[in-house]
């Protein structure tokens, strides 16, 4: 369902209560109008839980290319550059929506798909299980 | 234009070189079939750069609800629980695709939109600018 009043200029919808197949304009609108000066792409090197970025390409997916984070260490990097294994580097994961070509190879027909991607890593205190 | 063999069951495409308006099935397919046991939702509390999650809702967007991370501190939390301001908690941001209703209020017509979301926080060594 969707907010009313419904715009009279809307394309026709077979099932107006909950459309399952919709029209999507692929001309991407960018909400991030200006480059965010606080946004740094070198955090992956400067973090105490640094990560590498791995390229994942799937031509049947939109976007085709996704760069995924993989933590470099099990532990976290200390000020002296050594790894502290009393702490853990863990991936921060996020579920994102992508479009999957359906049927395969079709240029203009997709299905929404939810995938889990690792965006970066963070340093956490481990959960210690005490044995009675 | 897309890879061939082009599926003969594809919906028609007006401009085969670069389809701008496509059909999308909103029945979401979830690729993350099993719940990942390693995927923890308490990292935001256990991290040395902890964060709070803020709900962002927009009925004209799909998905309408997005949770955004905001770092709790400027510095990073040490083992003793105090904040170390010689280190910085910074948001890990990712550009994601969402669907924006276009025209507004239309139930079955969208445009792809790119938005920047903060997924979590990580602890980084600050960049020190030395003054001559």
């Amino acid at each position: 369902g969707i907010a009313i009043p419904r715009n009279s200029g809307c394309p026709n919808s077979e099932d107006k209560n909950f459309p399952r197949t919709v029209m999507v304009n692929l001309n991407i609108h960018n909400r991030n109008t200006s480059t965010n000066p606080k946004r740094s792409s070198d955090y992956y090197n400067r973090s105490t839980s640094p990560w590498n970025l791995h390229r994942n390409e799937d031509p049947e997916r939109y976007p085709s290319v996704i760069w995924e984070a993989k933590c470099r260490h099990l532990g976290c990097v200390k000020a002296d550059g050594n790894v502290d294994y009393h702490m853990n580097s863990v991936p921060i994961q996020q579920e994102i929506l992508v479009l999957r070509r359906e049927p395969r190879h079709c240029p203009n027909s997709f299905r929404l798909e939810k995938i889990l991607v690792s965006v970066g890593c963070t340093c956490v205190t481990p959960i210690v299980h005490h044995v009675a | 234009g897309i890879a061939i063999p082009r599926n003969s069951g594809c919906p028609n495409s007006e401009d085969k070189n670069f389809p701008r308006t496509v059909m999308v099935n909103l029945n979401i397919h979830n690729r993350n079939t099993s719940t990942n046991p390693k995927r923890s939702s308490d990292y935001y509390n256990r991290s040395t750069s902890p964060w709070n999650l803020h709900r962002n809702e927009d009925p004209e967007r799909y998905p309408s609800v997005i949770w955004e991370a905001k770092c709790r501190h400027l510095g990073c939390v040490k083992a003793d629980g105090n904040v170390d301001y010689h280190m910085n908690s910074v948001p890990i941001q990712q550009e994601i695709l969402v669907l924006r209703r276009e025209p507004r209020h239309c139930p079955n017509s969208f445009r792809l939109e790119k938005i920047l979301v903060s997924v979590g926080c990580t602890c980084v060594t600050p960049i020190v600018h030395h003054v001559a």
Partner: antibody, heavy 121, light 106 residues
């Protein structure tokens, strides 16, 4: 109009490094990866690697891993390729080319004009 | 690495001829890309995703193939078509190119 404008020709000594720039205009810089390809005199094309200006991610042809460094500056929409420990066989024209992250079917669609790097003692 | 072998390496033909260039991959690949390059110039994307003509490419060009064998065909050769053509694969790392086919005027 989409343009990839590369820096000028370079003459380098063996063992030194070279840094080639590629200034992009006419499109959203972070929507495209930048790939680097080289062509030795009278030879074919050889892929060096890719940089994603959006995430900072890089991936290299193993042949160049450790010697090539690909970077990008989003604020100036400029990509860079640095090649170290130069040898005579690195003498080539170096090209940058863009690659759409969202629809990879389109491949490498626009190319820079090329930068000639000559390695000679 | 996936090797791409183009044949012939060079070809002399006349205006109006039908010309076919083949590209054979050492392993199966999903798509092939073709680039045209003229002396002293940058390569130009010519055919992408095996079959699709890049913007501005005349319809006398066509691409076909699957698996390991791909072809670029020019139905009626024109003076501006004389150039070197490279095939390219990006199904497997490292991405590779064929050695090129130089198309010359007879």
């Amino acid at each position: 109009e989409v343009q990839l404008v590369q820096s000028g020709a370079e003459v380098k000594k063996p063992g030194s490094s070279v840094k080639v720039s590629c200034k992009a205009s006419g499109y959203t810089f972070t929507d495209y990866e930048i790939h680097w390809v080289r062509q030795a005199p009278g030879q074919g094309l050889e892929w060096i690697g890719v940089n994603d200006p959006e995430s900072g991610g890089t991936f290299y042809n193993q042949k160049f891993d450790g010697r090539a460094t690909l970077t990008a500056d989003k604020s100036t929409s400029t990509a860079y390729m640095e090649l170290s420990s130069l040898r005579s066989e690195d003498t080539a024209v170096y090209y940058c080319t863009r690659y759409y992250r969202y629809e990879s079917f389109y491949g490498m669609d626009y190319w820079g004009q090329g930068t000639t790097v000559t390695v000679s003692s | 690495d996936i090797q791409l072998t183009q044949s012939p390496s060079s070809l002399s033909a006349s205006v109006g001829d039908r010309v076919t260039i083949t590209c054979s991959a050492s392993s199966s690949i999903s798509y092939i890309y073709w680039f045209q390059q003229k002396p002293g110039k940058s390569p130009k994307r010519w055919i992408y995703a095996t079959f699709e003509l890049a913007s501005g490419v005349p319809s006398r060009f066509s691409g076909s193939g699957s698996g390991t064998d791909y072809t670029l065909t020019i139905s009626s050769l024109q003076p501006e078509d004389f150039a070197t053509y490279y095939c390219h694969q990006r199904s497997s790392y490292p991405w590779t190119f064929g050695q090129g086919t130089k198309l010359e005027i007879k």
